[in-house]
């Protein structure tokens, strides 16, 4: 912390301007006016301060706002924001998504640093939802946001923000995601045409339940195998031969190069071999002929 | 085909909470999403919320705070608890398959249980 | 929340002639609307889905109309099974909400 010493006679700050590059660290504690700095802040950014400068202006402004700086002031730290912990952050209010904006500008380019999740995480318990214009932005700086969020803060997510979200930003999604994601997407594409409905249902559909993919199987989709293969497991075994042919429409053929791995091996191990032979593929492992299928999960539930 | 079958506790004293179970039977509970529904005395249907059989459920914001709903599969069971409960909180409670196979899309309801009377009272 | 409201409240009817029900909603819920039909002691059934498709097993005489907000269910012509209390429930968005029932009688 900086000691209090009077500021030397004629270095008075009237303004935040490039002279107080020359201030010494005590200078600028003395000699900058917190109120002023407060009204000024837009201009720091363009001053290069350096970083033991900007750690003495960030001391004045948490003497001036020890509750948590105002809005008015956080819109404009610019590169401060860097200075700040996920402490100070935590007492902030930010409500304006220009200002969520402007800081997510800061950081643009690297990793989520924990002031950065700080943010967001006041930011949309702030709003209550995460509604389409913010989940716009955080997937714009960070195409992963949606899927470090847990399930419960997926929850969270209203329908109409969906429109909102690209293929991309679920590709690291796991399935409890998608199982929360799956649903509203459904619920929000659900006036759109068959063709339009599956292009943007497609990327979602690590989380629908068979009955789902059976429908969908009856619209001439065309799944292409990448899709296919984030199915869910449990999902995909209860699909009949002639159900996968036509889900899958041409790309069924790409079945071959995957028939080791999950979901299309054990997908393969639950339909009688007869059946397989009928996609001309050469897949192998299905049931053989005159074999009897007891669902035992079925049976354990039934009795 | 496929049933649903109600049951739990009929009479629930006010402040404690209700614990309701739903049995699938005659098919597998993890090819839909199973909804709770509601219809106090006399009047109109309300919707509680709903569960997926990986246990992602969603609910009605009315009843959020109050309300977990919660699934068995080796049971092939979903069940619901709603705490705190008042006079207000007395209805027939029903369970319900949410749509599968004739649309893709779409949040209504095709299969129904009977129902079964809650009756919240000291 | 949406908020269905159905009219009329009760709705007299002879066998034989033509009921219709009417259902709107507080907001546009495009085309996804269900109708039930519900006798005492019985679990709700679904008629209609989609405004104006019918459930498997319905029969003919029952008919679903209309978009955005305003639906008509029409009984063409009343067989003495059909007298129950009608429900009309949106599913454009969550929560799911029901209309508060139109109870069909015999005139």
């Known amino acids: 912390e900086v000691e209090k010493t009077a500021c030397p006679s004629g270095k008075k700050a009237r303004e935040i301007d490039e002279s107080l590059i020359f201030y010494k660290k005590w200078e600028l504690e003395a000699c900058v006016d917190a109120a002023l700095l407060a009204t000024q802040m837009d201009r720091v950014n363009a001053i290069p301060f350096t970083y033991e400068q900007l750690d003495v202006l960030k001391h004045k402004l948490d003497e001036l706002y020890p509750q948590g700086y105002p809005e008015s002031v956080i819109q404009h730290l610019g590169y401060l924001f860097l200075k700040m912990s996920p402490e100070d952050i935590r007492k902030w209010n930010v409500t304006s998504l220009e200002t969520l904006k402007a800081l997510l500008e800061v950081n643009k380019g690297h990793e989520m640093s924990p002031q950065v999740a700080t943010l967001i995480d006041r930011f949309v318990k702030g709003r209550g939802q995460l509604d389409k214009d913010t989940l716009d932005t955080l997937t714009a700086f960070y195409p992963g946001y949606l899927c470090s969020l847990s399930p419960e803060e997926l929850s969270s997510v209203p329908p109409s923000s969906i429109w909102a979200v690209r293929p991309q930003d679920l590709d690291t999604c796991d399935p409890r995601q998608l199982d929360v994601l799956y649903p509203k997407a459904r619920l929000a594409f659900q006036n759109m045409n068959g063709s339009e409905y599956f292009v943007k249902i497609q990327s979602f559909l690590g989380g629908a339940p068979t009955e789902d993919l059976k429908a969908l199987s009856q619209q001439n989709v065309s799944m292409d195998l990448a899709t296919f293969m984030k199915l869910r497991t449990d999902a995909v075994l209860p699909l009949t031969v002639a159900e996968v042919q036509k889900l899958l429409g041409p790309h069924v053929e790409g079945l071959k190069a995957e028939e080791r791995h999950r979901p299309v091996r054990d997908w393969i191990l639950r339909q009688r071999q007869d059946d397989l032979d009928t996609l001309g593929l050469g897949l192998q492992g299905g049931i053989p002929n005159g074999y009897l299928v007891l669902d035992l999960s079925m049976q354990e539930a039934l009795s | 085909q496929v049933q649903l079958q109600e049951s739990g506790p009929g009479l629930v004293k006010p402040s404690e909470t209700l614990s309701l179970t739903c049995t699938v039977s005659?098919?597998?509970?993890?090819?839909?999403?199973w909804s709770w529904v509601r219809q106090p005395p006399g009047k109109g249907l309300e919707w509680i919320g709903y569960i997926f059989y990986s246990g992602s459920t969603n609910s009605n914001p009315s009843l959020k705070s109050r309300v977990i709903i919660s699934v068995d599969t080796s049971k092939n069971q979903f069940s619901l608890k709603l705490s705190s409960v008042t006079a207000a909180d007395t209805a027939v409670y029903y369970c319900a398959r949410e749509v599968g196979r004739i649309a893709v899309a779409g949040w209504f309801f095709d299969l129904w249980g009977r129902g079964t009377l809650v009756t919240v009272s000291s | 929340e949406i908020v269905m409201t159905q009219s009329p409240a009760t709705l007299s009817v002879s066998p034989g002639e033509r009921a219709t029900l009417s259902c709107r909603a507080s907001q546009s819920v495009n085309s996804n609307l269900a109708w039930y039909q519900q006798k005492p002691g019985q679990a709700p059934r679904l008629l209609i889905y989609?405004?104006?498709t019918r459930a498997t097993g319905i029969p003919a005489r029952f008919s679903g109309s209309g978009s955005g907000t305003e639906f008509t269910l029409t009984i063409s012509s009343l067989q003495s099974e059909d007298f129950a209390v009608y429900y009309c429930q949106q599913y454009n968005n969550w929560p799911l909400t029901f209309g508060q029932g139109t109870r069909l009688e015999i005139k």
């Open positions: 005659g098919g597998s509970i993890n090819n839909y999403y």
């Open positions: 989609g405004a104006s």
